[in-house]
């Protein structure tokens, strides 16, 4: 906290400029008018203030706007944004995408900080949903943004926004998140033809049910092994050898290298060894000939 002292003669700031970096903390406190600072915030970003000096400037704005800064000031905070706490940001009402972009630009190249996370949360809540423009902006700055949201938060993403999602945006999503996103993607891309549809839906297939995988196997899609390995195990298990062969096309040979990993391992255990042998890949571990397979889960459901 800077104690109140009178501004020395001739030092009263008439504008926000580089002469202020030569002021001591107490001089900044005494000689810079908060209202002047608020109207000329856009100049601060070009001036190399020390961290200590920035603390004083922030303190002045806090005094001027105890209920939270207006958006006209927030948009021009520049690197003073890095001094804000999540508690400060919770007082803000940010509605403009331009303001959001300006502040994300300040943090560009760094991990998402608690401040940025709070800012995004305030912005999205203010909008009521994660619209396409917002999603475009957020994933441009933070490719992993979507996967940082809970399934509940993802449920507010309208299908139309899915067009903004790039494959790398889903890299860190877990199955629960893909379970929410996949139906939205299916809806968003429903009017596309077979091959184009597959290109778009491929990244979301970790949330696809068995029946959709069966349908894809009829369309000569040639799914790569990386995509196959991300599919839900429970969705893969009911697929027949013939369906997997059609689904993977020429990539079916890759199953051999993955035979010890899920979901391939679990799928092999469910297939008849005779059927697996038809692939000619030397996959082992299937059900020997003459054995009967009882689906105990089905039996329990009936009893």
């Amino acid at each position: 906290e800077v104690e109140k002292t009178a501004c020395p003669s001739g030092k009263k700031a008439r504008e926000i400029d580089e002469s202020l970096i030569f002021y001591k903390k107490w001089e900044l406190e005494a000689c810079v008018d908060a209202a002047l600072l608020a109207t000329q915030m856009d100049r601060v970003n070009a001036i190399p203030f020390t961290y200590e000096q920035l603390d004083v400037l922030k303190h002045k704005l806090d005094e001027l706007y105890p209920q939270g800064y207006p958006e006209s000031v927030i948009q021009h905070l520049g690197y003073l944004f890095l001094k804000m706490s999540p508690e400060d940001i919770r007082k803000w009402n940010v509605t403009s995408l331009e303001t959001l972009k300006a502040l994300l630009e300040v943090n560009k190249g760094h991990e998402m900080s608690p401040q940025v996370a709070t800012l995004i949360d305030r912005f999205v809540k203010g909008r009521g949903q994660l619209d396409k423009d917002t999603l475009d902006t957020l994933t441009a700055f933070y490719p992993g943004y979507l996967c940082s949201l809970s399934p509940e938060e993802l449920s507010s993403v309208p299908p139309s926004s899915i067009w903004a999602v790039r494959p790398q945006d889903l890299d860190t999503c877990d199955p629960r998140q893909l379970d929410v996103l996949y139906p939205k993607a299916r809806l968003a891309f429903q009017n596309m033809n077979g091959s184009e549809y597959f290109v778009k839906i491929q990244s979301f297939l970790g949330g696809a049910p068995t029946e959709d995988l069966k349908a894809l196997s009829q369309q000569n899609v040639s799914m790569d092994l990386a995509t196959f390995m991300k599919l839900r195990t429970d969705a893969v298990l009911p697929l027949t050898v013939a369906e997997v062969q059609k689904l993977l096309g020429p990539h079916v040979e890759g199953l051999k290298a993955e035979e010890r990993h899920r979901p391939v391992r679990d799928w092999i255990l469910r297939q008849r060894q005779d059927d697996l042998d038809t692939l000619g890949l030397g996959l082992q571990g299937g059900i020997p000939n003459g054995y009967l397979v009882l689906d105990l889960s089905m039996q329990e459901a009936l009893s």
């Epitope: 580089e18 970096i21 970003n45 070009a46 001036i47 190399p48 520049g78 690197y79 890095l82 300040v106």
Partner: nanobody, 112 residues
């Protein structure tokens, strides 16, 4: 992003001279004010000299006026600080800054 790298620091006797350089890379510097700061052990960082890249305006701290000169070379994207008549109290780590970006600093020691 802007990267700033200072050089030219060292040990010098009182009354001697040094020339510090700050090489900038990354974003263009026209929109920034550039400055030299210094920080002595146990003291706050203080501004020594500044140059407004677009207007050319120069400002010096009272303690270095007439002894230090800040300049720039646009073609090399480099900032300089010519320090003459050095005193023991000029001993500090000297930092170059442009807007929000800071260099790592270079040590200047004035001692006999």
């Amino acid at each position: 992003q802007v990267q700033l790298v200072e050089s030219g620091g060292g040990l010098v006797q009182p009354g001697g001279s040094l020339r510090l350089s700050c090489a900038a890379s990354g974003r263009t510097l026209e929109s920034y004010v550039m400055a030299w700061f210094r920080q002595a052990p146990g003291k706050e960082r203080e501004a020594v000299a500044s140059i407004n890249w677009s207007s050319g305006r120069l400002i010096y701290a009272d303690s270095v006026k007439g002894r230090f000169t800040i300049s720039r070379d646009n073609s090399k994207n480099t900032l300089y600080l010519q320090m003459n008549s050095l005193r023991a109290e000029d001993t500090a780590v000297y930092y170059c800054a442009a807007g929000r970006y800071w260099g790592q600093g270079t040590q200047v020691t004035v001692s006999s």
